[in-house]
Amino acid sequence: CKAMHVAQPAVVLASSRGIASFVCEYASPGKATEVRVTVLRQADSQVTEVCAATYMMGNELTFLDDSICTGTSSGNQVNLTIQGLRAMDTGLYICKVELMYPPPYYLGIGNGTQIYVIDPEPCPDSDF
């Protein structure tokens, strides 16, 4: 297993609709034809997998059904979008990239993107 550099933004603020997008960029040492991207969430020293996708050459990542992630790729950049976020989902979202083929296998893990999610205030009842 060889190491690879992965860059991602330090902080992202989710939209009022609970959507957060960020770019995950990896320094590919060669021309990989099969890449696996995994988003991990770290909160309170617990790490959980949010979503993962394997892609080849195309520019749309396909995630498992009911995934909260969508994404596209362009060169060595992956544009990730996480939907349905709520305040309790605030945390560090880490991008993990694996170059699956051809050998050798490379693994890169980003420093994480702190995603802040603020639940929208409910509209006050109107007397009118």
Epitope: M56, G58, N59, E60, T62, D65, Y101, P102
Partner: antibody, heavy 115, light 106 residues
């Protein structure tokens, strides 16, 4: 030019298995997904699954889980799709198609399941 | 699974007509891709990533949309356009196709 050549038509009995091959040429075999799609007579298209020819990574449509197996032979640039426990509803034309965009398709293999 | 519903399922039109086929997704998708299939033939990629024409596809074909609503438009029907059209999503597994729209000569 890119070509996908599939094996010939098959007639099978219910409960049997069928193995369809798809031989690729004209491009780098390990660079693109190979997808399998079937089409029952007079019906629409149904995605069965895909395989990454380099690593052998597979994704299957859960509708076929336990019945479908996709494999590849990189030495001959050939992908195989095996469907087991056949039933009459599996009578269809089976296509292989390459790439994320299903850019190129094989000519199709007619599989008939009949007692 | 993401369901794709095409409308109409059947469409009768004449050469020179402008026709629009709609593809509605049960959940938001990143892109929609369109295929054309003629009887006894394998499907052919027509439009990918919602609006990009595949190589060799005439400019009378166009695609648009986002989220859950997408359309395929043929600006001026030609005799060779009478076929069945399918939309497809690959945002999530399993990849799914619409049920198809059969375009027939009026």
């Amino acid at each position: 030019q890119v070509q996908l050549v599939q094996s010939g038509a098959e007639v099978k009995k219910p409960g049997a298995s069928v193995k369809v091959s798809c031989k690729a040429s004209g491009y780098t075999f390990t660079s693109y997904w190979i997808n399998w799609v079937r089409q029952a007579p007079g019906q629409g298209l149904e995605w069965m699954g895909r395989i990454a020819p380099g690593s052998g990574t597979t994704y299957y449509n859960e509708m076929f889980t336990g019945r479908v197996t996709m494999t590849r032979d990189t030495s001959t640039s050939t992908v195989y799709m095996e469907l087991s426990s056949l039933r009459s509803e599996d009578t269809a034309v089976y296509y292989c198609a390459i790439g994320d965009y299903f850019d190129y398709w094989g000519q199709g293999t007619m599989v008939t399941v009949s007692s | 699974d993401i369901q794709l519903t095409q409308s109409p399922s059947f469409l009768s039109a004449s050469v020179g007509d402008r026709v629009t086929i709609t593809c509605s997704a049960s959940k938001s998708v990143s892109y929609i891709h369109w295929y054309q299939q003629k009887p006894g033939k394998a499907p052919k990629l027509l439009i990918y990533d919602t609006s990009t024409l595949a190589s060799g596809v005439p400019s009378r074909f166009s695609g648009s949309g986002s989220g859950t609503e997408f359309t395929l438009t043929i600006s001026s029907l030609q005799p060779e356009d009478f076929a069945t059209y399918y939309c497809q999503q690959r945002t999530t597994y399993p990849l799914t196709f619409g049920q198809g729209t059969k375009l027939e000569i009026k």
